[in-house]
């Protein structure tokens, strides 16, 4: 790249016009403060490219650095950039304006940093002060960049004199961050291995400096050294990795593996550690189990979840009534086992829109060549109560018999109630539950049957009314944890010629 006039620094008169030309072997352009100002690009007769930047009617605000760069940085040979700096002395402008974020300067460790207060005139004398103290600090000043040095956590201002007036800059705030200059990460292919398996630990550091990797590991104690493989990692940003590999682990290889990365031999740098467990045999252990009886509701979906810890990864089987379950094509059943962490797993059986036929005895088995666990439970499918029949009969002895039959799971409870005022019953008058009346008036008999094939209970309750002297509304109500159902019948005395 060639800049004309060559610079590297120009001092322009205010309101003047200035022309800069940059030439190169590929298309070029001018940049100013990461912006691309208006410019004229051209291809020359000799095959070179140029761009002309014309600064017209310049002000102090035009003070700053200008870069000529290749338009499209294709490869390292075109990453070259040329810099020039322009001053436009402007007595009306003190310090060049700063973005508010540039007033906060964060420093890591004890590194040099720059307080970037700049003026438009390179002849001006500029001093740096702690804001609270008026004594100038002895820090080198570069009119193009500002004050560069090592600064404490304080507030600073820059001062200059233009004509006969003293001008102060904005306040700069310096904060030091205690951050290591090296960013190290360590991970292992597996942190749990069986004896005889391999251990592989990877240590990665950001940056492209020449760094020293120092590993410490349990084998070192017995003088058996492992040669790590250290290399750059492909891609950008640049990183360097070191891999420690032990092909055949022993129980004594359990312990802490530390990767220490330093820039120089006497520098502590940064280190990260990881714990490795070498075990004699694999294992499977249940962490979260299910109850002896698990409940599902008819036509609702139900997830049965088992959490276990294992190494190596086990095979998992779910069985129902000792028959192996598999994902159903119809989507009624979904089986999945997934990693929660390196050695922790969750296995789920999802029953979609549960059917009565899915009630039964379930088992989950998790196993590998070293160990196995199993977990069994009964799945109960709860079915809402239905009153299937409410009938009335008149035996010859003058009694009135009302029979109520219903089904549900779990076992329904039966409640009988009566109401004598038919006009107001049941909306305006609560029915009277039976049970308080004397034995002579009514007799109740309830039988319960469990139907194995339907996996639900059937309740048959018979109410015998000895004497009915006026029309009576009788309600049979069945209830379980899934809800309730009821039916009513109106019973009339024998003497009345009709029933309502």
């Amino acid at each position: 790249l060639v800049i004309t006039p060559p610079g590297p620094e120009f001092v322009l008169n205010i309101s003047s016009t200035f022309v800069l030309t940059c030439s190169g072997s590929a298309p070029v352009m001018w940049e100013q403060m990461s912006q691309v100002p208006w410019q004229e690009a051209a291809m020359n007769q000799d095959g070179t490219f140029s761009s002309v930047l014309t600064l017209t009617n310049v002000t102090g605000g035009d003070t700053g650095e200008y870069f000529c760069v290749y338009n499209n940085s294709l490869g390292p040979e075109l990453s070259e950039r040329k810099r020039i700096y322009i001053f436009v002395p402007d007595p009306t402008m003190g310090f060049l304006p700063m973005d508010s974020e540039d007033l906060f300067i964060f420093v890591t460790d004890v590194t040099e940093t720059t307080i970037p207060c700049r003026v438009t005139d390179p002849q001006l004398e500029v001093t740096l002060h702690e804001k609270k103290v008026d004594i100038p600090l002895h820090v080198p000043y570069d009119h193009q960049r500002g004050f560069t040095g090592t600064f404490e956590d304080k507030t600073y201002i820059c001062k200059t004199t233009i004509g006969d007036r003293e001008v102060d800059s904005d306040t700069y705030y310096v904060y030091s961050l205690q951050v290591s200059s090296i960013n190290v990460s360590v991970n292992a292919v597996q942190t749990v291995v069986r004896q005889g398996e391999s251990i592989t630990i990877r240590c990665i550091v950001m940056g492209n400096d020449v760094v020293n990797f120092q590993w410490t590991y349990p084998r070192m104690k017995s003088g058996r050294l492992v040669e790590p493989v250290t290399d750059y990692l492909f891609g950008v940003p640049s990183r360097i990795g070191s891999i420690l590999h032990i092909p055949t682990a022993e129980l004594s290889d359990s312990g802490t593996y530390t990767c220490n990365v330093s820039v120089s031999v006497n520098d502590h740098g940064d280190e990260k550690a990881i714990n490795i467990s070498v075990i004699e045999n694999g294992y499977v252990r249940l962490l979260e189990t299910l109850g002896d009886v698990e409940i599902a509701e008819l036509h609702r979906s139900r997830t049965l979840r088992v959490v276990f810890e294992a190494y190596p990864m086990p095979s998992v089987l779910w069985l129902k009534d000792n028959r192996t379950l598999g994902d159903s094509g119809a989507g009624e059943l979904v089986l999945s086992t997934r990693n929660m962490s390196e050695t922790r797993y969750v296995s789920e059986l999802i029953l979609v829109r549960v059917k009565v036929s899915e009630a039964g005895y379930y088992t989950m088995r998790a196993f590998h060549e070293d160990d196995e666990v199993q977990l069994s439970f009964k799945l109960q499918v709860n079915v809402p109560v239905r009153v299937l029949e409410l009938s009335e009969s008149h035996p010859a002895n003058g009694e009135q018999t009302i029979r109520c039959r219903g089904r549900g799971m779990p076992q329904p409870n039966v409640t009988w109630s009566t109401c004598r005022d038919l006009k107001r019953c049941p909306r305006k008058l609560s029915p009277t539950p039976l049970g308080n009346s004397s034995k002579e008036e009514s007799q109740l008999e309830t039988n319960v049957t469990f139907w194995e094939e339907d996996q639900e209970y059937e309740v048959v309750s018979t109410l015998r009314l000895r004497h009915v002297d006026q029309p009576l509304s009788v309600r049979c109500m069945l209830q379980n944890s899934m809800g309730g159902d009821s039916q009513e019948v109106t019973v009339v005395p024998h003497s009345l010629p009709f029933k309502v």
Epitope: R202, I204, Y232, V236, G241
Partner: antibody, heavy 116, light 103 residues
């Protein structure tokens, strides 16, 4: 001894695709960066693609970027280079390499000719 | 990476081949004939594979890597490539090669 054996070269048609495989032996394959370097007739060495051991990160040479894919199978100790949309200028001997910052082992090479 | 296109050395003499423009590490590779497999002579500036004769050595000073062959032999006639990691690209680049002629 460290050996790197390439396969998959031969006569290819422009616009077609190429798949080269390199099998490593005699070393812990999973611990090493692997890659491909090529040499066109009468020319120098040119980096094609690389894949890191530590995190499977990849890099591609400018001439093949966007057309190449490199992958590795540590279980099989193999590294594969897939190169699509072949051009005449892809004609070269392709070498499998071990290493990133410095190459410490080379395969014998497999010749690829792209011609109609 | 910049390296001389050719150098010559007397049989039994010493020759140095330089490479500049790289970063932290240089490697040196010998190729006896075009298309034949290169052989790594030096990696990481000065490390020599166990099967490489001790007459080949590597060093780095500043940003320049140097391959030194002491006691040059007739079979050392070959093209020598330098390689170095390129941070901006994220991979290693190569020099154009130096042809060694043994006189």
């Amino acid at each position: 001894a460290v050996t790197l054996d390439e396969s998959g070269g031969g006569l290819q048609t422009p616009g077609g695709a190429l798949s080269l495989v390199c099998k490593g032996s005699g070393f812990t394959f999973s611990s090493y960066n692997m890659g491909w370097v090529r040499q066109a007739p009468g020319k120098g060495l040119e980096f094609v693609a690389g894949i890191s051991a530590a995190d499977n990160s990849t890099a591609y040479g400018a001439a093949v970027d966007g057309r190449a894919t490199i992958s590795r199978d540590n279980g099989q100790s193999t590294v594969r280079l897939q190169l699509n949309n072949l051009r005449a200028e892809d004609t070269a001997t392709y070498f499998c390499i071990r290493g990133g910052g410095s190459i410490d082992a080379w395969g014998h090479g497999t010749e690829v000719i792209v011609s109609s | 990476l910049t390296q001389p296109s050719s150098v010559s050395a007397n049989l039994g003499g010493t020759v140095k081949i330089t490479c500049s423009g790289g970063g932290s590490y240089y490697g040196w590779y010998q190729q006896k004939s075009p298309g034949s497999a290169p052989v790594t002579l030096i990696y990481y500036n000065d490390k020599r594979p166990s099967d490489i004769p001790s007459r080949f050595s590597g060093s780095k000073s500043g940003s320049t890597g140097t391959l030194t062959i002491t006691g040059v032999q007739a079979e050392d006639e070959a093209v020598y490539f330098c390689g170095a990691w390129d941070n901006s690209a994220g991979y290693a680049g190569f020099g154009a090669g130096t042809t060694l002629t043994v006189l």
